[in-house]
Amino acid sequence: EVEKTACPSGKKAREIDESLIFYKKWELEACVDAALLATQMDRVNAIPFTYEQLDVLKHKLDELYPQGYPESVIQHLGYLFLKMSPEDIRKWNVTSLETLKALLEVNKGHEMSPQVATLIDRFVKGRGQLDKDTLDTLTAFYPGYLCSLSPEELSSVPPSSIWAVRPQDLDTCDPRQLDVLYPKARLAFQNMNGSEYFVKIQSFLGGAPTEDLKALSQQNVSMDLATFMKLRTDAVLPLTVAEVQKLLGPHVEGLKAEERHRPVRDWILRQRQDDLDTLGLGLQGGIPNGYLVLDLSMQEALS
């Protein structure tokens, strides 16, 4: 906390400019008018104030706006944003995407800080949903942003926003998140033709049900093994050997290398060994010939 001392003669700041970097903290406190600072915030970022000096400037703004800064000030915070606490940010009402971009730019190249997370939360809640422009902006700065949201939060993403999602944005998503995103992607891309559709939907297939995988197997998509390994186990298990062969196309040979890993391992256990043998890959562990397979879940459903 800087002591309240009178401003030395001739040092009263008439504008926010480079000369202020030579002021000690107490001089900034005494000689810079908070209202002047607020109206000339756009200049602060271009002036190389030390972090200690920025603390003083923040203190002045806090005194001027105890209920939270107006957006006209927030948009020009620049490096001063790094001095804000999540508690400060919770007082803000940020509605402009330009303001959001300006503040994310300051934090660029760093991990998502609690301040940034709070800012994004305030912004998205204010908008009511994650629209395409917002999602575009957030994933540009933080590719993992989408996967940091809960399934409940993802449910507010409109299908139209899915067009902004890049494959790398989904790298860290878990199956629960993909379960929410997949139907939205399916809706978003429904008017595309077969091969184009598969290119777009591929990243979301970790949320696809069995019937959609069966449908894809009829379209010569040649799914790669990396995508296949991310499919839901419960969606893969009912697929026949013929369907998996059609789904993977030339990539079917990769099953051998993955036979000990899910979902391939569990799928093998559900197939007849003679069906697996037709692939000529030496996959072992299928149901021996002559055994009868009872689907108990089906039986329970009927009773």
């Epitope: 030390t50 000096q53 490096y79």
Partner: nanobody, 115 residues
């Protein structure tokens, strides 16, 4: 890694002269605005002088006319020529890139002026 090494400090009598040097590595020196900061015992950090990449200079009121900042891009070094030294110039002097926004932090070089 950005490294700045200050040297040239010492103990002198009031009215004498000292020349501080700061040798930089790990960044493009020619493109950087540089500054000399100082911190006296029990006082707060103060910016003494700056030199921008285009060579323009600025000084704190307390040292104007006595201190001169300069740089040698070939040697990646910035200097602070201090004349007519006063006891109140006693401090640890540090050089920084202005973009770092760090101010008085790190080793620095101690200047002691006795009357």
């Amino acid at each position: 890694e950005v490294q700045l090494v200050e040297s040239g400090g010492g103990s002198v009598q009031a009215g004498e002269t000292l020349r501080l040097s700061c040798t930089a590595s790990g960044f493009t020196f020619d493109d950087s605005d540089m500054g000399w900061y100082r911190q006296a015992p029990g006082d707060e950090c103060e910016l003494v002088s700056t030199i921008s990449s285009d060579g323009s200079t600025n000084y704190a009121d307390s040292v104007k006319g006595r201190f001169t900042i300069s740089q040698d891009n070939a040697k990646n070094t910035v200097y602070l020529q201090m004349t007519s030294l006063k006891p109140e110039d006693t401090a640890i002097y540090s050089c920084r890139t202005m973009a770092s926004r760090i101010g008085c932090w790190g080793q620095g070089t101690l200047v002691t002026v006795y009357s």
